[in-house]
């Protein structure tokens, strides 16, 4: 980028630049129209019989420098070829010198600083590349002269550029003084400010552009050279905040629109709201749970919301005495997640209709919550008594939900108890042909035994035809026809109101071999 | 020598037109740029019309602007001023005047008038 | 556009300096002219570019310009310098050439 500091063909009114000696034969401001039919200013010399040592000086006005520290200056020129003026003495040159002189202020004179090398810094001879033919009677021929010339390095506040003709025939055509930056550039969403080189290269430190947020890494910089060009180099840049994403050509940063998010800072667009979130608002950096669905704190910003599962179905209880097995189906609603569990609540009802929920005894085996397979078993329940289980499906989400917790009940009453084996017993009398037993009276917990029932067969004869049946009621009993010198496996149960209870073990009695033995008494 | 004359004025009558002349010699005509400059009786200079040296760009003051055109013959080293819709305030003594001339590009000029003719009267009246 | 104002008349004896002012709105950033005219006869450029001289013209004649004012100068007057003075310059547009009110110098 090119910051002009002076532009004569831009200029409306005369130049008025400084000329010395004030003699004949010096530099003179013509004025004409450009392409445009804007006037222009040039300035012209031909002194081509100058006596020896004579130049002729031409200075601009003082140029304020801007804080450029180089400053280039394009010089447009047409120069008479001596030859084909008449006039021209061994004197005639077709080159001209051009000098700097650096001031902090527009002191200069029309005899100050002198006018000589220095103070006046050369800054080089032009010679003609071109050189115009001027025959007499006829126009002028020849092609204009471009030169660029850089001056410096400047420090002070300004400077006058300063043209020494010795004997030319030419014309300024134009001036144009400038000085080279490297105009503002944003890449990769870092903005460089226009920067004006102070030496071959400078860094220049970037700053991120609005809603971006530095790339992780050393601070973005850029190297601004004297050319005014920005060096290629990689950019660790910034990148687009969360809620905007790169725009433009990676320039600057836009807010994502409603409807989309973005939850991170760094590459990457804006995505639409997953399931049952929604942003309202431009900009978001996470979509809002639509009412009734949430995010678990281990969600990702940018994973769907969910919601509680329904109900677990079809729950099924297996009761076998004292222990209960329970199975269900998943639910309906699995909230849109993976991570379902079951639970279990209980409560108990005593005979006497009193409930309470589930006391210590009961043991659940995997375990009351945290189920991840549809089942459970229930151990240690008391007989008589009616369960309410209440199965529900839980999720990652379901502490955040308000309001009950859906959940599929089941109801289970145990049997009562029944009187327990009948175990000690003992034969009171044998004979060839029959055996007297008696046994302990057991402790029934619902109520009194009403009778027993004695189940007795001969051992080895083991098929169901071979087993007799004796009700008593009384804890004794006579078992008669038997075969002599027999070996008999006897049981006992005993039954309450709640039922019979489980036959007792075996017992190994055996009948007399003979009949004059009588009858004796065994005890157990 | 170097000089120009001017010709062409006289008596003219409201509305109507003149055509003034300007003969250059002694310098390199096409290399001038050239202008037309009037004085009214008792008034003071009042510049009227000019012309590049080529003859391309032409430029009048607003008071003559429409009414009156320069021109230029090259080839015989002449100036002109049509004068039309003449009105009674256009009378003036009506000078020739060459502008300061380049070293060797017609393209451009000096600002002042550094050669005048020596005038030639028009007269608008009924 | 620039309008230069002169004074109508100026007055000096013999062998003094008369001095003829032209002023104008910021005129020291334009070059001035300046113009004889004797009675009867065409202008004569006396000075041009502010104080240059053309060959031919006295060396009492010189001219200034500076901030808003223009002036011509000529140092020990002479008789045969009674004449009309005319400044001129350019306006804004390049080939509008714009002059003076005029100046009668009389000398006593």
């Known amino acids: 980028l090119e910051e002009t500091l002076l532009n004569t063909k831009l200029e409306t009114a005369d130049l008025k630049w400084v000329t010395f000696p004030q003699v004949d034969g010096q530099w003179e401001e013509l004025s004409g129209l450009d392409e445009e039919q804007h006037s222009v200013r040039t300035y012209e010399v031909c002194d081509v019989q100058r006596a020896p040592g004579q130049a002729h000086w031409l200075r601009t006005g003082w140029v304020p420098r801007r804080g450029a520290v180089h400053v280039y200056a394009t010089l447009r020129f047409t120069m008479l070829e001596c030859l084909s003026l008449p006039r021209a003495g061994r004197s005639c040159k077709e080159t001209f010198t051009v000098f700097y002189y650096e001031s902090d202020a527009d002191t200069a004179t029309a005899l100050t600083p002198a006018w000589m090398e220095n103070p006046y810094i050369k800054v080089d001879t032009v010679a003609a590349e071109h050189l115009t033919r001027k025959r007499p009677g006829a126009e002028a021929t020849g092609k204009v002269n471009v030169k660029t010339l850089r001056l410096g390095p400047l420090s002070k506040a300004g400077f006058y550029l300063a043209f020494q003709d010795q004997g030319a025939c030419m014309a300024l055509l134009s001036l144009h003084l400038f000085y080279k930056k490297c105009a503002q550039l944003t890449v990769n969403l870092t903005r460089f400010p226009e920067t004006v080189p102070r030496e071959l290269v400078v860094p220049v430190a970037g700053s991120c552009v609005v809603d971006a947020v530095p790339a992780p890494g050393p601070s973005p910089s850029l190297y601004c050279r004297e050319d005014g060009q920005w060096a290629e180099q990689p950019v660790t840049g910034c990148s687009c905040a969360p809620g905007f994403e790169a725009a433009e050509g990676n320039t600057k940063c836009r807010a994502c629109a409603q409807g989309t998010f973005k939850p991170l800072s760094g590459e990457g667009s804006c995505q639409p709201c997953p399931a049952n979130s929604h942003s309202n608002t431009i900009g978001s950096a996470v979509c809002q749970c639509r009412v009734g669905y949430f995010r678990a704190r281990t969600d990702p910003r940018g994973a769907p919301c969910t919601t509680p599962p329904s109900a677990p179905r079809s729950v099924v209880s297996r009761l076998n005495g004292s222990s209960l097995h329970l199975e269900w189906s998943a639910p309906l609603e699995s909230g849109g997640r993976e991570d379902l569990t079951y639970a279990l609540r209980c409560r108990e009802c005593r005979p006497g209709g009193s409930c309470a929920p589930c006391g210590g005894d009961l043991t659940f085996d995997p375990g009351p919550r945290d189920l991840v397979e549809p089942w459970v078993v229930v151990r240690g329940l008391r007989p008589d008594f009616t369960y309410t289980f209440e199965v529900t499906a839980l999720n990652g989400v379901s502490s955040l939900a308000t309001g009950p917790v859906p959940f599929e009940p089941v109801n289970v009453t145990t049997d009562r108890e029944v009187p327990p084996a009948v175990s000690d017993i003992r034969v009171t009398r044998s004979s060839p042909s029959s055996l007297s037993l008696a046994w302990a009276v057991p402790r029934a917990p619902s109520g009194a035994v009403l009778d027993y029932e004695v189940k007795y067969h001969e051992k080895g004869a083991e098929g169901p035809s071979s087993v007799r049946f004796l009700k008593t009621s009384e804890n004794r009993a006579e078992l008669r026809g038997l075969k002599r010198g027999a070996s008999y496996l006897v049981q006992v149960r005993a039954r309450s109101e709640a039922g019979y209870g489980p036959f007792g073990q075996e017992h190994h009695s055996q009948t007399q071999l003979d009949e004059s033995e009588g009858w004796r008494e065994q005890l157990a | 020598q170097v000089q120009l004359v001017e010709s062409g004025g006289g008596l003219v009558q409201p509305g109507g037109s003149l055509r003034l002349s300007c003969a250059a010699s002694?310098?390199?005509?096409?290399?001038?740029?050239m202008s037309w400059v009037r004085q009214a009786p008792g008034k003071g200079l009042e510049w009227v019309s000019g012309?590049?040296?080529?003859?391309?760009?032409?430029f009048y003051a607003d008071s003559v602007k429409g009414r009156f055109t320069i021109s230029r013959d090259n080839s015989k080293n002449t100036l002109y001023l049509q004068m039309n819709s003449l009105r009674a305030e256009d009378t003036a003594v009506y000078y020739c005047?060459?502008?300061?001339?380049?070293?060797?590009?017609?393209?451009?000029?000096?600002?002042?008038?550094?050669?005048w003719g020596q005038g030639t009267l028009v007269t608008v009246s009924s | 556009d620039i309008e230069l104002t002169q004074p109508p008349s100026v007055s000096v004896a013999p062998g003094q300096t008369a001095r003829i002012s032209c002023s104008g709105d910021?005129?020291?950033?334009?070059?001035v002219h300046w113009y004889q005219q004797k009675p009867g006869q065409a202008p004569v450029l006396v000075i041009y570019?502010?104080?240059k001289r053309p060959s031919g013209i006295p060396e009492r004649f010189s001219g200034s310009n500076s901030g808003n004012t223009a002036t011509l100068t000529i140092s020990g007057t002479q008789a045969e310098d009674e004449a009309d003075y005319y400044c001129?310059?350019?306006?804004?547009?390049?080939?509008?050439?714009?002059f003076g009110g005029g100046t009668k110098l009389t000398v006593l």
């Open positions: 005047a060459r502008k300061g001339m380049s070293f060797y590009n017609n393209k451009y000029a000096k600002s002042m008038f550094d050669l």
């Open positions: 002694g310098f390199t005509f096409n290399n001038a740029w």
């Open positions: 012309i590049s040296a080529d003859g391309v760009h032409k």
């Open positions: 910021n005129l020291g950033k334009k070059y």
């Open positions: 570019y502010d104080s």
């Open positions: 001129s310059a350019w306006t804004t547009t390049m080939m509008h050439i714009v």
